[in-house]
């Protein structure tokens, strides 16, 4: 007996779709091997019409496709569009040739069924209306009108021209005429339900003179549309449910034994499950809207809904679409932490993963806010500057090529704790969400800048040094001059660098920047970090205020703009690695800096961490406390 | 809730047919796949067959042990649930059970099911 298991028939008619899952035994070789799908010939050949290794024949090409689900130790193969043509036998198996284990399935497509021919067949979804037609001899005009279900024994009144009603239809159900027509009458029933399907007649006049009409009304749950999305990334629910229902409250429940637990609605709701992970946009006044879920877990896969009622809460009778989510945990996007944290004052560094093969897409950050439906306003991107309320404490360095870029969020306070994602404008699967804990601070910060009060006079010589601990010795240190368009690496001096490397003296690592002559332009925000390669550490910032010089001093001349920023002492003791690194200018908002536009993107998702020691604290709390505080609070 | 009644039960000879009945009534429309598992006394309950749908497309899986003798069939409008047993042998005799589910991720395993019929006998004498 195979040890392979799977349907062994399955019936559906023409035109219609197959989801065919195959299980096969929990060994690591299992998971990893070829999966094929071939047909049984008459000679005992067994021909591949579609495999995981990327084959696919002819015959299935633009309708079939193979998805292996190794954490389930299942395959799925999904044919649509299917004819009588593909009636047959068939195997679904592991292995490098179609001789390996296998199971075999029969597959039977049928001809869609005819009905008589007198009868009228009507074809709705769940929660719409149906207008039937129901023509009559001029003669007839005068009498009753009336439209009935037919049941085992007798045709029960579903209303008629009296005004009779039967009970499940009031409300429901409207007998009319258009204009001077007298030769047909209409019935329309609207909020159907799977209990409205069945045949009806429809009758005008008595006895053998009537006229009478068979009606075949069919109520169609709608089918689930099959999604399948790999783990972290993240998935856009496009929902249409039509001009009628526009100004209805909008839900997406997802379904649980009998029930539908609403996820979220336009109402306010929210599974805290979700929390920093959802948005819901309604788009037009058609009753389309769209949810996006980002950050896929393994538990997200299942059967979800979407519809719209006035309670934002499922509701029979109103229309619905559907959807099956699987999530593959065989996943191209890098499993990160989904928690980073910080301490007040202190400072993240947060690696943002993207599609490697889009290094020159834009990259963004948006703090997700879920008031309301829901959004993500940009705070940062590579070419959106930054935002007013994080000027000086904010920046995105973006390393082309390699695969991630990082934001740095400074000078920390307990209202940045929340939920931020990093996303593009490429490949949307990459969008990550990332939680961001912020604690009060208990030690004294890793980096500390002296001189506390940072003024420097105009024309003359002005230098700040960041002290760092021993634990930083091996890393990288840097200054950075802060615009709202990055943060411009400058050349320093890491007086560290001097000692013998086999004793750190803890009181006299640091790496001090000197402005010579100081400008007015060199007021602003500065920032000592450390970093290892491309992957950065804490930061502190310090804003150096820039005063005239007070009657009596001496006069320096003004120097190169360029070479204001000059190293403290020997020019061979500075780290050349650090000097002169410019992160690129973002000039003009991108297309995301709009927050419409960021509950509008398209697909994707993922959790995310911190690179570098999360925790860090701002050494110049105390020297630049006025200037903080009139930024940021 | 769904409530499955079996019926169809009874004392038969081997190489006899019998033909069990599961009708399914309540929120029957949340149901995606029904089947029949037995057990036997002393013995774990194991799969028999089972039925799952989507939209007109119908999908049968069953146990080696019963393949080729046994039938699984559905009466969409009647919510019922059909298992053909032909060519009976000593070794099916058992309980058997209808079950429900809402979702079915291997159904094989009795707990994805999730409501059960109260069981009918089934014995085959030699």
């Known amino acids: 007996k195979s040890p392979i298991f799977g349907p062994q028939e399955v019936s559906s008619i023409e035109g219609d779709s197959v989801s065919i899952t195959c299980y096969y035994p929990d060994t690591s070789v299992n998971r990893h091997t070829r999966k094929y799908w071939c047909r049984q010939g008459a000679s005992g050949m067994c021909t591949t019409l579609i495999s995981s290794n990327g084959y696919l024949s002819k015959e299935y090409s633009g309708r079939a496709n193979l998805i292996n689900f190794p954490e389930n130790n299942t395959f799925v193969i999904n044919i649509e569009q299917l004819t009588q043509d593909d009636t047959g036998s068939y195997k679904c198996g592991l292995g490098t040739s179609n001789r390996g284990l296998s199971f075999d399935v029969s597959l039977e497509v049928s001809q869609v069924p005819e009905l008589p021919s007198d009868t009228h067949v009507y074809t709705k979804d769940i929660g719409r209306n149906v207008t039937i037609e129901c023509p009559f001899k001029r003669e007839n005009a005068p009498s009753k009108k009336s439209l009935c279900k037919k049941t085992n024994q007798s045709c029960e009144l579903v209303i008629d021209s009296t005004e009779k009603v039967n009970p499940s239809y009031i409300g429901r159900a409207k007998l009319f005429m258009k204009g001077t027509d007298l030769t047909v009458f209409y019935v329309n029933i609207s909020h159907l339900t799977h209990n409205d399907a069945g045949l009806y007649i429809c009758q005008a006049g008595e006895g053998p003179s009537a006229d009478k009409k068979n009606v075949d009304l069919q109520v169609l749950a709608p089918e689930p549309e099959l999604l399948y999305k790999d783990l972290r990334s993240s998935v856009t629910f496009e929902c249409d449910l039509g001009r009628e229902v526009a100004n209805e409250a909008k839900y997406l429940c997802r379904m649980n034994k009998e029930t539908c637990d609403v996820i979220i609605n336009t109402l306010g709701k929210r599974d805290p499950d979700f929390e920093g992970r959802i948005l819901i946009t309604p788009k037009d006044d058609n009753g389309r809207f769209s949810v996006l879920i980002t950050g896929l877990r393994k538990e997200d896969a299942g059967h979800y809904q979407c519809g719209a009622h006035s309670s934002g809460l499922p509701q029979e009778g109103w229309p619905i679409q559907t959807w099956q989510l699987f999530v593959n945990e065989e996943s191209t996007i890098p499993n990160r932490r989904s928690v980073v944290k910080g301490v007040t004052g202190g400072s993240v560094a947060i690696a943002c993963p993207y599609n490697p093969k889009e290094s020159s897409s834009l990259k963004y950050w948006c703090r997700w806010e879920g008031d309301g439906n829901g959004h993500c306003p940009v705070l940062v991107g590579t070419q959106a500057q930054v935002q007013e309320e994080y000027e000086g404490r904010l920046a995105l360095f973006d390393q082309p090529g390699n695969g991630t870029y990082t934001v740095i969020l400074n000078q920390l306070t307990t209202e940045d704790a929340g939920f931020y994602w990093c996303l593009t404008n490429g490949d949307s699967r990459w969008r990550t969400t990332i939680e961001l804990q912020v604690a009060e601070a208990t030690r004294e910060p890793n980096l500390e800048v002296t001189p506390q009060n940072a003024t420097a006079v105009l024309g003359e010589t002005f230098t700040v040094s960041c002290h760092y601990p021993c634990k930083f010795y091996s890393q990288e240190k840097y200054w950075c001059k802060w615009s709202n368009k990055g943060c411009h690496i400058l050349p320093s001096h890491d007086e560290g660098a001097r000692q013998s490397s086999v004793s750190c003296d803890q009181s006299s690592q640091l790496v001090s920047m000197t402005l010579n002559p100081v400008s007015k332009e060199d007021e602003g925000w500065y920032w000592c970090g450390v970093k290892q390669g491309q992957t950065y550490g804490e930061t502190t910032a310090i804003y150096i205020a820039v005063e005239e010089r007070t009657r009596g001093s001496s006069h320096v001349n003004p120097t190169d703009a360029n070479a204001r920023a000059k190293v403290a002492l020997e020019e061979e003791v500075v780290d050349s690695s650090i000097s002169e690194k410019e992160n690129k200018a973002i000039p003009n908002p991108g297309p995301f800096a709009n927050e419409r536009e960021i509950q509008n993107v398209g697909d994707q998702a993922q959790e995310n961490r911190a690179s570098g020691d999360a925790g860090s604290a701002d050494g110049q709390s105390r020297s630049s406390s006025s200037k903080h505080h009139h930024h940021h609070h | 809730q769904v409530q499955l009644v079996e019926s169809g039960g009874g004392l038969v000879q081997a190489g006899d047919s019998l033909r069990l009945s599961c009708a399914a009534s309540?929120?029957?429309?949340?149901?995606?796949?029904m089947g029949w598992f037995r057990q036997a006394p002393g013995k774990e309950r194991e799969f028999v067959t089972t039925?799952?749908?989507?939209?007109?497309?119908?999908?049968?899986y069953y146990a080696d042990s019963v393949k080729g003798r046994f039938t699984i069939s559905r009466d969409n409008a009647k919510n019922t649930v059909y298992l053909q047993m032909n060519s009976l042998k000593p070794d099916d005799t058992a309980v058997y059970y209808c079950?429900?589910?809402?979702?079915?991720?291997?159904?094989?395993?009795?707990?994805?099911?999730?409501?059960w019929g109260q069981g009918t006998q089934v014995t085959v004498s030699s």
């Open positions: 039925i799952t749908w989507s939209g007109s497309t119908n999908y049968k």
């Open positions: 079950a429900a589910s809402t979702v079915l991720t291997d159904p094989r395993v009795p707990t994805e099911y999730d409501y």
């Open positions: 309540g929120r029957t429309r949340t149901t995606y796949g």
